[in-house]
């Protein structure tokens, strides 16, 4: 049996339906809903048998629906129960506020019934415009919503909705002006050069997402060049620019893909950093000197080439620091025109290129380095040279065994002849030569020059003194003298002065006749040209007289006698005696006696005769003075 | 009374030549050394040449070497100073002067100027 | 460049004593000898050797030497003293007769 069916409303969108029914096994159950006024088709649903109850929703609010069930069992269908029921009155939402206004965002929060929404259809329009509303669907247990993405300081309408089962409720609508976006502050340029500038700008700390950078040449169609940096960057350097050129760069901040108002500022980037003045000048003949200005740019380095004006092909380059603005370029070829070029290279820019043309010099040289006009304490010098290319000459004058002080001149580059005085006669000396240009010295040349002996007059001896004279000689200088003299005064000046003039080849004199035992100066002087050197001088005593003593008479025998003498050892050659009667009656005898003999026994005289003995002593042919004694023969 | 008396003075061009003769009176000529001795206008003395009694032995100064040659003739109791290639520093007073074995010039005569020039 | 060097002038007052000088190398081995020059005129010799006057020289003048230097002096000089002076040696046989560069003797 199938009975007690009871419909209660559940919701305002549907029905519940209870009833009983024996437990046989039903096969199912038939449903039927018809609104009651039949204005539209039935909905019919089927059931399983084994239920007793069934929810039946998607219905119309406020609607009075009659609902019908049979059951089926065994293919018999059962009566029908039939019922009437109205569904409940749609709920309305509450209230909808804006919570939080923003410059791009709001918060929407609004009362609804619990349960009663599947979701919420929310709609952004904006006031005054035809542009399409921004539609979004929340869902039905939330009452809070944020709305992002809205433009500052804009009026929207912003509409919400309770949606259920095809059903919306009627739309609360609210009314809400965003606010202004946040200002960024001031937009400026700290640094400005030919290629880059460097920007800053002022903002509230943690606003952006990200900034916006345009740069536009001024004036010009080209397209902008942007940048997007990060929103905690507050300064830029904007690179790749070109020099001297005007440029609006402008800046905007981005939060949440919204655009601040740009701030924009115009500058000129500085003009292309130029080389001036290069200047070339010779260092000496195998160089050259540039000099270059430039400002004081960090110049990465200067690049230089050098190359011979006739030569295209051999071209010499360098690199050098951008610290520098002169550089030397040694090496180069003599009297030669070179043409140098130089540019700088600044951040991967290269400078237009300065270029300027200069010759070395020629090549100085010295040679046939001369000595001549050589006296005792001087000498010549003539040498060849470059003409105008010296400002001075080195000479430097070394003795060859080191031990006088090196002497050194300089003299002006036009001379090529210098008197070199003051030196010392008979010495060896090398003479060094070296030219002095701007920034060289040529190499050194060289001659080696002998001063002359002076005219020497030395070593004046005296040799072979005797009793009456002495042998005078002396060196002098083969050539040196016409003539010499030799004066000889006695040293108590109570003699004339003897004077000999000799040849200027003769270096002896051998002089004679002079007195036995007494003191002479001997003065030498040599004449050159009339001219006399101060004399050589010496003293010497000539030897005293040899003498023969004490002749004695002894042993007196009828026939002869025995006679003995001293003398000054060693000094005669040999004796003489001569003896005689004094009465003169016979011939005189004369016996010579070798020197070292003392005594000599006389005999052959006759007896009882008185005899005169006489003895002299020769000396180098010349003889002493002779002693005297008187003898007498004994008896027979 | 010691006489000497230069000639020959006179103006030539460089390169040219001249001839200086010293005539000798006073003194025996072939017993004395003879010499020439010149002065730069406005300069002073400076040694030319020399030559002994007999002509054998002659002494030049190195500015003339080779170029002058001294000579004398002692019969006729004259000097001379032959110059060649003269140049204009050779222009000067031309002094004949002579000496004793054993003095300096002691004797000189009045001078001839010889003028260098173009 | 003499080898031997002089003072180019001296002066001195009339009748004062007055030292001129010579100096060279050559000086240490012969003695100098000194010639007057007046202008236009020839030299004339006043001292030679040790300190010799030809016939005629008036005995105020005198010479010295001493190392590598020569003096002649005039011991009270007078007015015709006035004159340039020329030292002379010999140097040699390369240079047997030199000269100094001459003194000009002034007489105030």
């Known amino acids: 049996e199938l009975e007690n069916l009871t419909v209660t409303e559940v919701g305002w969108d549907g029905l519940r339906l209870n009833w009983t029914a024996a437990d046989q096994a039903y096969e199912h159950f038939i449903i039927q809903v018809q609104e009651a006024n039949k204005v539209e088709a039935a909905r019919n649903l089927t059931v399983p048998g084994s239920l007793r109850a069934v929810d039946i929703p998607g219905l119309k609010a406020a609607t009075p629906y009659t609902v019908s069930i049979y059951g089926v069992i065994q293919g018999y269908r059962t009566p029908v129960l039939s019922a009437e029921a109205s569904t409940g009155e749609t709920p309305n939402l509450g209230e909808v506020v804006v919570a939080e206004v923003g410059w791009d965002a709001l918060k929407l929060n609004w009362t609804a019934p619990e349960g009663a929404y599947e979701y919420f259809f929310i709609q952004v329009q904006e006031a005054d415009t035809v542009e399409a509303a921004q539609n979004l669907t929340v869902p039905g247990g939330l009452r809070s919503t944020d709305l992002p993405g809205l433009k500052a300081a804009t009026h929207y309408t912003i509409t919400i909705r309770g949606v259920t089962q095809d059903f919306s409720t009627t739309p609360l609508s609210v009314e809400v002006l965003t606010e202004e976006v946040p200002d960024m502050g001031n937009l400026t340029v700290t640094e400005v050069s030919w290629d880059a500038l460097r920007l800053n700008w002022t903002t509230p700390d943690g606003t952006y997402d990200q900034f916006t950078i345009q740069v536009q040449e001024a004036d010009q169609v080209e397209e902008a060049h942007n940048l997007t940096v990060p929103g905690s960057l507050r300064s830029m350097e904007i690179p790749g620019l070109r020099a001297g050129t005007p440029y609006t760069v402008t800046l905007h901040g981005e939060v949440r893909g919204h655009s601040t108002r740009p701030l924009a500022v115009e500058v000129v980037t500085e003009d292309l950093p130029q080389l001036g003045d290069l200047a070339v000048s010779e260092v000496g003949w195998d160089g050259l000197r540039l000099n270059w200005t430039a400002a004081d740019n960090a110049y990465e380095h200067f690049v230089i080439q050098v190359q011979e004006v006739n030569k295209v092909e051999a071209a010499q380059n360098l690199t050098l620091p951008g610290s520098l603005r002169a550089v030397d370029i040694p090496g180069l070829e003599a009297a030669t025109p070179y043409r140098v070029s130089i540019y700088g290279v600044i951040r991967g820019y290269r400078t237009p290129v300065l270029s300027a043309e200069a010759s070395t010099a020629k090549e100085p040289e010295i040679g046939n380095l001369n000595v001549s006009d050589i006296t005792p304490e001087s000498f010549n010098l003539s040498w060849m040279a470059t003409d105008g290319i010296f400002e001075t000459f080195t000479i430097e004058i070394i003795d060859s065994n080191r031990l006088l002080e090196t002497v050194e001149y300089n003299i002006s580059g036009a001379e090529r002849t210098a008197h070199i005085s003051g030196l010392p006669p008979s010495t060896d000396f090398i003479v060094y030569l070296s030219g002095l240009a701007p920034s060289i010295r040529t190499k050194t040349i060289s001659a080696t020059a002998t001063t002359e002996a002076l005219p020497l007059l030395e070593n004046l001896t005296i040799s072979d003194i005797n009793p009456y004279g002495f042998t005078v000689s002396w060196m002098a200088s083969e050539n040196a003298f016409d003539s010499f003299l030799v004066t000889v005064v006695d040293s108590g000046k109570l003699l004339d002065p003897q004077e000999f003039t000799l040849s200027g080849t003769q270096r002896k004199l051998e002089l004679r006749g002079l007195i036995t035992g007494i003191g002479y100066e001997v003065m030498v002087s040599g004449f050159t040209q009339g001219h006399q050197t101060k004399p050589l001088r010496a003293e010497i005593v000539t030897e005293a007289e040899p003498e023969v003593d004490n002749l004695l008479v002894s042993d007196a025998t009828p026939d002869g006698f025995r006679l003995s003498w001293t003398a000054d050892e060693g000094v005669f050659d040999n004796f003489v005696l001569k003896i005689r009667d004094t009465k003169k009656q016979s011939e005189p005898l004369e016996i010579t006696l070798l020197a070292p003999e003392r005594t000599r026994d006389i005999t052959g005289l006759r007896e009882a005769t008185e005899y005169e003995i006489e003895l002299y002593g020769i000396s180098k042919g010349r003889r002493s003075q002779t002693v005297s004694a008187i003898a007498t023969t004994a008896m027979g | 009374e010691v006489q000497l008396v230069e000639s020959g003075g006179g103006l030539v061009q460089p390169g040219g030549s001249l001839r200086l003769s010293c005539a000798a009176s006073g003194f025996t000529f072939s017993g004395s050394r003879m010499g020439w001795v010149r002065q730069a206008p406005g300069k002073g003395l400076e040694w030319v040449s020399a030559?002994?009694?007999?002509?054998?032995?002659?002494y030049y100064a190195d500015s003339v070497k080779g170029r002058f040659t001294i000579s004398r003739d002692n019969s006729k109791n004259t000097l001379y100073l032959q110059m060649n290639s003269l140049r204009a520093e050779d222009t000067a007073v031309y002094y004949c002067a002579k000496h004793p074995p054993h003095r300096p010039f002691d004797y000189w005569g009045q001078g001839t100027l010889v003028t260098v020039s173009r | 460049s003499s080898e031997l060097t002089q003072d180019p002038a001296v002066s001195v007052a009339l009748g004062q004593t007055v030292r001129i000088t010579c100096q060279g190398d050559s000086l240490r081995s012969y003695y100098a000898s000194w010639y007057q020059q007046k202008p236009g005129q020839a030299p004339v010799l006043v001292i030679y050797g040790k300190n010799n006057r030809p016939s005629g020289i008036p005995d105020r003048f005198s010479g010295s030497s001493s190392g590598n230097t020569a003096s002649l002096t005039i011991t009270g000089a007078q007015a015709e003293d006035e004159a340039d002076y020329y030292c002379?040696?010999?140097?040699?046989?390369?240079?047997?007769?030199?000269f100094g560069g001459g003194t000009k003797l002034t007489v105030l």
């Open positions: 002379n040696s010999s140097h040699g046989p390369r240079r047997p007769v030199v």
């Open positions: 030559i002994n009694e007999e002509g054998g032995q002659t």
